[in-house]
């Protein structure tokens, strides 16, 4: 899989490029410099920076917590009026307690009604989610295996035979019509049977070409 090994024998280099073992490393390999430079930041400086970052994060969390407290305070102040007890005697205070208790009972009733609605909505959402999963189950897509190939081989596999057509993979994979559902299900079965045969690049090429 590694390329350029013959060149390495003829021309010795001061820092050889790291051997790519996976195609997933390709992008990183292309963007990174071949010779890795040693970090100029000392361990103590790194620790200092880490501590600083932690401090900033802590301050940010504290600020968020303070904001939440402030928001709660603001919300409560709009809902709960400050008690006006000046000039009220025992009789009024007693009656005020009765009024406030009645208000609490009313709010409790409303809360119960809202909770019932929320529970109903949660149940409906769960049912709909289940229906979505059930519908998805009818149109299973093949699970593609990761294949270790070079970038050139991959480009050839993708563009070689069908260079003229655009590579809109979604269009290829998602063209499902209602009348073809049975056919699709049969295909899914075939995929499972021939999974080993199709796991190679040739098999994948065949699938794209069909």
């Amino acid at each position: 899989m590694a390329d350029g090994s013959s060149d390495a024998a003829r021309e010795p280099r001061p820092a050889p490029a790291p051997i790519r073992r996976r195609s997933s490393n390709y992008r990183a390999y292309a963007t990174e410099p071949h010779a890795k430079k040693k970090s100029k930041i000392s361990a103590s400086r790194k620790l200092q920076l880490k501590t600083l970052l932690l401090q900033i994060a802590k301050q940010e969390l504290e600020r968020e917590a303070e904001e939440r407290r402030g928001e709660k305070g603001r919300a409560l102040s709009t809902r709960c009026q400050p008690l006006e007890l000046a000039g009220l005697g025992f009789a009024e205070l007693q009656d005020l307690c009765r009024q406030l208790h009645a208000r609490v009972d009313k709010v409790d009733e409303e809360r119960y009604d809202i909770e019932a609605k929320v529970t109903k909505n949660i149940t409906e959402i769960a049912d709909l989610t289940q229906k979505i999963f059930d519908l998805r189950g009818k149109f299973k897509r093949p699970t593609l295996r990761r294949v270790r190939i070079s970038a050139d081989a991959m480009m050839q596999a993708l563009l070689g035979a069908r260079a003229k057509e655009s590579l809109d993979l979604r269009a290829h994979l998602k063209q499902v019509k209602k009348e073809d559902t049975e056919k699709e299900n049969r295909e899914v079965g075939d995929w499972r049977k021939n999974i080993d045969a199709l796991s190679g690049m040739e098999g994948r090429k065949k699938k794209f070409e069909s």
């Epitope: 006006e84 000039g87 005697g89 025992f90 009024e92």
Partner: antibody, heavy 121, light 107 residues
Framework: EVQMVESGGGLLKPGGSLKLSCAAS????????MSWVRQTPEKRLEWVAT????????YYPDSVKGRFTISRDNAKNTLYLQMLSLRSEDTAMYYC??????????????WGQGSSVTVSS | DIQMTQTSSSLSASLGDRVTISCRAS??????LNWYQQKPDGTIKLLIY???RIHSGVSSRFSGSGSGTDYSLTISNLEQEDIATYFC????????TFDTGTKLELK
């Protein structure tokens, strides 16, 4: 000098509505709870309504609850009594009074001159 | 509701007399009892609050006493300006209630 002046009274038919006003002066109005008390033609005194200093809380006897509404405007030093669905038994002299308390005891320490309301068909 | 009752609706007395007006509550009102005076012109004034406290500007000839359910207002050395109707009011429970009043007249 503490003073209360009522206005807005009159003669009206049963089922009618009326709004009484009371202009207060001579004291820091917003520091006191206020009340309305009426006196029937038989000279009986009946407490009608009380409102807290900022207007958040109001108190009524069952006889007027749901029909009468006490309110206040601290900026204008004015107390109001909105009366709806008036009945013949609401016929009375309506007094505006400053309310105070001592060790929890509730009393009206200063009263206005009254405003007459007559409900008759 | 707490009912307030006075022993007599009217009372006759002579100038200089000591007059006592009584008031009873249908239940214990813990001294939350107030007395008012209404003059013939309709003017209402607070005289006594919390059973025995004299309101500012009120003559010391007026005094109040009592506890539990029984209370009284006393006018010592009755004067012409005291001729009025006197009401008691409980400040213990909503609704605040008044008695029917005692009309004080000269003999």
């Amino acid at each position: 000098e503490v003073q209360m002046v009522e206005s807005g009274g009159g003669l009206l038919k049963p089922g009618g509505s009326l709004k009484l006003s009371c202009a207060a002066s001579g004291f820091t109005y917003s520091n006191y709870a206020m009340s309305w008390v009426r006196q029937t033609p038989e000279k009986r005194l009946e407490w009608v309504a009380t409102i807290s200093t900022g207007g958040s809380y109001s108190y009524y006897p069952d006889s007027v609850k749901g029909r009468f509404t006490i309110s206040r405007d601290n900026a204008k030093n004015t107390l109001y009594l909105q009366m709806l669905s008036l009945r013949s038994e609401d016929t009375a002299m309506y007094y505006c009074a400053r309310k105070d308390n001592y060790y929890g005891s509730t009393f009206m320490d200063y009263w206005g001159q009254g405003s007459s309301v007559t409900v008759s068909s | 509701d707490i009912q307030m009752t006075q022993t007599s609706s009217s009372l006759s007395a002579s100038l200089g007399d000591r007059v006592t007006i009584s008031c009873r509550a249908s239940q214990d009102i813990t001294q939350y009892l107030n007395w008012y005076q209404q003059k013939p012109d309709g003017t209402i004034k607070l005289l006594i609050y919390y059973s025995s406290r004299i309101h500012s500007g009120v003559s010391s000839r007026f005094s109040g006493s009592g506890s539990g359910t029984d209370y009284s207002l006393t006018i010592s050395n009755l004067e012409q300006e005291d001729i009025a109707t006197y009401f008691c009011q409980q400040g213990n429970t909503i609704p605040l209630t008044f008695d029917t009043g005692t009309k004080l007249e000269l003999k």
